[in-house]
């Protein structure tokens, strides 16, 4: 189990009101065990909406760092290179789980937060306004 | 939170002993709550890189609905509409953390679990490889 | 099956720059799935971080405080190597030297694989 | 910095007895970036446990880890002849703040 003298403040994990709470085993299981994948490698380079990766950091947070994908360009890349103004590089967002320590600094109690990170970038027709 | 009827054979949530856990608020917070996004909207038409989007569905993980995308094609879509096989459509995959019940069905036992889903898609110029 | 062989001199004049290159076999330096970083192990000072390089997207630094002002970790890609300098040496830098890979799946952190070591003493 | 206070110094035990290694951090830390190496005279470290409780590769079920917070534990359930070695715990907690604790020495009695 886990000794950790209590922190005065902290909730009291034995606490049956203690409000909608669950008991979570932080042994983390890796559901993709058979393979190491270099989950999106390079693509930040060789996609027609190339990415650059920010460190977006915070020690209080499971986990400390993310990687956040910001697009290179408004427009995508042709096969010459140049940029097509005509297309748009837009991020693919996706909500993500993250562990906080609430109240901050508790050893043993955490809570879920929601973040919205992007991911990577696609290139898309953009969606033009006719204006009457 | 959840509200499920307790499972005799249940961990005891206020067991001192509970393998390494602790209490986790399930009260979600959501950082970015100043706008509720469209996240990807509708980026999974629009891109040169089109993707469906399948439902992911398991009662005992939280969350339970998972959308993971599938290319639709190998190349990508040209301004014509047709689809350039020069070119690779690929998924932007991302490891995110879920809560799975374990043991299975009971209400107040989690564990961590990290899964690997495919988020979107981007049009990727090929590596070519080539033979002596 | 990674490996790390390091290499440089063992003996360093105080003032002068210690430098050391460590050559990664079965793994890239610009692997997005790593960090390539030093650490340091003396009587005195137990084991030491003194900082790492990642790639993603464009290298990344992190340096230990205590030597932030002396060191740099460079990549070299075509050689599939990297160095660690430390400038105006003293007899306090004297330690067995590791280059090691860092797992930086940002679910978790630790040293796998690690170099053989390399004793650099300073000293006139 | 986070500072991670090992103790005992010295471990002194024999063959086949449980020997409990403490790592205390300064302040809270993730389990998940805490790791424990093994160090032989002469060689380099190895990573026995890594996320505080879980084994990395080859090493032996004897070895175990765990703990949350700024208190955690390696345990050796039956020391081998080969085990004794000093014991190293390690954290990262925010760049560029990665420390190591001064290590237990577990010997022969």
């Known amino acids: 189990g886990i000794a950790i003298p209590r922190n005065s403040g902290c909730p009291n994990s034995e606490d049956k009101n203690f409000p909608r709470t669950v008991m979570v085993n932080l042994n983390i299981h890796n559901r993709n065990t058979s393979t190491n994948p270099k989950r999106s490698s390079d693509y930040y380079n060789r996609s027609t909406s190339p990415w650059n990766l920010h460190r977006n950091e915070d020690p209080e947070r499971y986990p400390s760092v993310i990687w956040e994908a910001k697009c290179r360009h408004l427009g995508c890349v042709k096969a010459d290179g140049n940029v097509d103004y005509h297309m748009n590089s837009v991020p693919i967002q996706q909500e993500i789980l993250v562990l906080r320590r609430e109240p901050r600094h508790c050893p043993n109690s955490f809570r879920l937060e929601k973040i919205l990170v992007s991911v990577g970038c696609t290139c898309v027709t953009p969606i033009v306004h006719h204006v009457a | 939170g959840i509200a499920i009827p307790r499972n005799s054979g249940c961990p005891n949530s206020e067991d001192k002993n509970f393998p390494r856990t602790v209490m986790v608020n399930l009260n979600i917070h959501n950082r970015n709550t100043s706008t509720n996004p469209k996240r990807s909207s509708d980026y999974y038409n629009r891109s040169t890189s089109p993707w469906n989007l399948h439902r992911n569905e398991d009662p005992e993980r939280y969350p339970s609905v998972i959308w993971e995308a599938k290319c639709r094609h190998l190349g990508c879509v040209k301004a014509d509409g047709n689809v350039d096989y020069h070119m690779n459509s690929v998924p932007i995959q991302q490891e995110i953390l879920v809560l799975r019940r374990e043991p299975r069905h009971c209400p107040n036992s989690f564990r961590l679990e990290k899964i690997l889903v495919s988020v979107g898609c981007t049009c990727v110029t090929p590596i070519v490889h080539h033979v002596a | 099956q990674v490996q790390l062989q390091q290499s440089g001199p063992g003996l360093v004049k105080p003032s002068q720059t210690l430098s050391l290159t460590c050559a990664i076999s079965?793994?890239?330096?610009?692997?997005?799935?790593?960090?390539w970083g030093w650490i340091r192990q003396s009587p005195g000072r137990g084991l030491e971080w003194l900082g790492r390089?990642?790639?993603?997207?464009?290298?990344?630094?992190d340096y230990a405080v205590s030597v932030k002002s002396r060191i740099t970790i460079n990549p070299d890609t075509s050689k599939n190597q990297f160095s660690l300098q430390l400038n105006s040496v003293t007899p306090e830098d004297t330690a067995v030297y590791y280059c090691?890979?860092?797992?930086?799946?940002?679910?978790?952190?630790?040293?796998?694989?690690w170099g053989q070591g390399t004793l650099v003493t300073v000293s006139s | 910095d986070i500072v991670l206070t090992q103790s005992p110094a010295t471990l002194s035990l024999s063959p086949g007895e449980r020997a409990t290694l403490s790592c205390r951090a300064s302040?809270?830390?993730?389990?998940?970036?805490l790791a424990w190496y093994q160090q032989k005279p002469g060689q380099a470290p190895r990573l026995l446990i890594y996320?505080?409780?879980n084994r990395a590769t080859g090493v032996p079920a004897r070895f175990s880890g765990s703990g949350s917070g700024t208190d955690f534990t390696l345990t050796i359930s039956s020391l081998e002849p080969e085990d004794f070695a000093t014991y190293y715990c390690?954290?990262?907690?925010?760049?560029?703040?990665?420390?190591f604790g001064q290590g237990t020495k577990v010997e022969i009695k």
């Open positions: 090691a890979r860092e797992v930086d799946s940002t679910y978790y952190s630790y040293f796998d694989i």
């Open positions: 079965g793994d890239s330096v610009s692997s997005s799935s790593a960090a």
């Open positions: 390089i990642s790639y993603r997207s464009k290298w990344y630094n």
């Open positions: 302040q809270n830390v993730w389990a998940f970036y």
């Open positions: 996320g505080a409780s």
């Open positions: 390690t954290q990262y907690y925010s760049s560029p703040s990665l420390t």
